[in-house]
Amino acid sequence: RAVPGGSSPAWTQCQQLSQKLCTLAWSAHPLVGHMDLREEGDEETTNDVPHIQCGDGCDPQGLRDNSQFCLQRIHQGLIFYEKLLGSDIFTGEPSLLPDSPVGQLHASLLGLSQLLQPEGHHWETQQIPSLSPSQPWQRLLLRFKILRSLQAFVAVAARVFAHGAATLSP
């Protein structure tokens, strides 16, 4: 677990859960609503979502030196997406399809964030942009965009944990 004082997370557990998150994010993507979206519009609505970037210490060298920076970044992203999945964007109309694994995705985001941050230790979390679409079609469009950026985010996180499990596990 990533705790104050810089001890390591349970890399293997994080690796397994992040791989599951990858599968869930991919499987959720086509199942977030009934509309056929050909026009996806501009990207401005999802510019504020967390991305893992070069300066975040998620490269092999950065992880070796101090994994805390990268893990904090991943944690921020997980909490950010978990809050979005619990928001009106996903709970409002049009309803998710019955087959949708969004509930599993929501629970897994929370589960991985808790693995990274035990109770009683608080990392700073990123503010969620105030996205409150009034129209069902806008909500649907946002779901697709959020899930697409989530797919990219968890793919990088899974690579980080795979590397950690292979090289940094005690």
Partner: antibody
Framework: HVQLQQSGPEVVRPGASVKLSCKAS????????MTWVKQRPGQGLEWIGQ????????DYNEIFEGKATLTVDTSSSTAYIQLSSLTSEDSAVYYC?????????WGQGTLVTVSA | DIQMTQSPASLSASVGETVTITCRAS??????LAWYQEKWGKSPQLLVY???TLAEGVPSRFSGSGSGTQFSLKINSLQSEDFGSYYC?????????FGSGTKLEIK
């Protein structure tokens, strides 16, 4: 329209294994999780596990770990459950159901009877 | 694992009456809850998902409500075809668990 067609009833000996099938039609098989549910006679429903066809990655209820193995054959849009080391406790109807949330589509169920 | 506590275990009602079945989750499951109807010898049928969304083809006399840990299924003006067993199921993370069921019988 969506259909899940399950294999016929099975009578098996204690200690043996059995493999049940669920053939899907009317939708893109690889885009949806496939779930398996157990129902013992006169009892409630138990979630066994689920599998996502594209990656073949399965998730199990801990109590069925080692008892059930889920697989898929994407070329024939068929999901399988193999049950091993059967005992009388495994006598039940086994359902396949589409999805990873609520289950709108179910197979007709396969009755497995474990009997010496 | 999340436990689902369903009540009552059984109830008798007459055609035309209104009945309510409740389901309690052992922890917050947001609105990730489904309700099913099961008749003897038939596969379960999805009635409600995401706590309150009616599944396709389900009559409007059925309605679901609740969020967090407390949920209910209400059936207005019972019809003879509504008798059978009802189950709740959470779909918030695995393992999914079902309630123990409510048997609805004709009075």
């Amino acid at each position: 329209h969506v259909q899940l067609q399950q294999s016929g009833p099975e009578v098996v000996r204690p200690g043996a294994s059995v493999k049940l099938s669920c053939k899907a039609s009317g939708y893109i098989f690889s885009a949806y999780w496939m779930t398996w549910v157990k129902q013992r006679p006169g009892q409630g429903l138990e979630w066994i596990g689920q599998i996502f066809p594209v990656r073949g990655s399965a998730d199990y209820n801990e109590i069925f770990e080692g008892k059930a193995t889920l697989t898929v054959d994407t070329s024939s849009s068929t999901a399988y459950i193999q049950l091993s080391s059967l005992t009388s406790e495994d006598s039940a109807v086994y359902y396949c159901a589409r999805g990873g949330g609520g289950f709108a589509y179910w197979g007709q169920g396969t009755l497995v009877t474990v009997s010496a | 694992d999340i436990q689902m506590t369903q009540s009552p275990a059984s109830l008798s009602a007459s055609v035309g009456e209104t009945v309510t079945i409740t389901c309690r989750a052992s922890e917050n499951i947001y609105s990730y809850l489904a309700w099913y109807q099961e008749k003897w010898g038939k596969s379960p049928q999805l009635l409600v998902y995401n706590a309150k969304t009616l599944a396709e083809g389900v009559p409007s006399r059925f309605s679901g409500s609740g969020s967090g840990t407390q949920f209910s299924l209400k059936i207005n003006s019972l019809q003879s075809e509504d008798f059978g067993s009802y189950y709740c199921q959470h779909h918030y993370g695995t393992p999914f668990t079902f309630g123990s069921g409510t048997k609805l019988e004709i009075k």
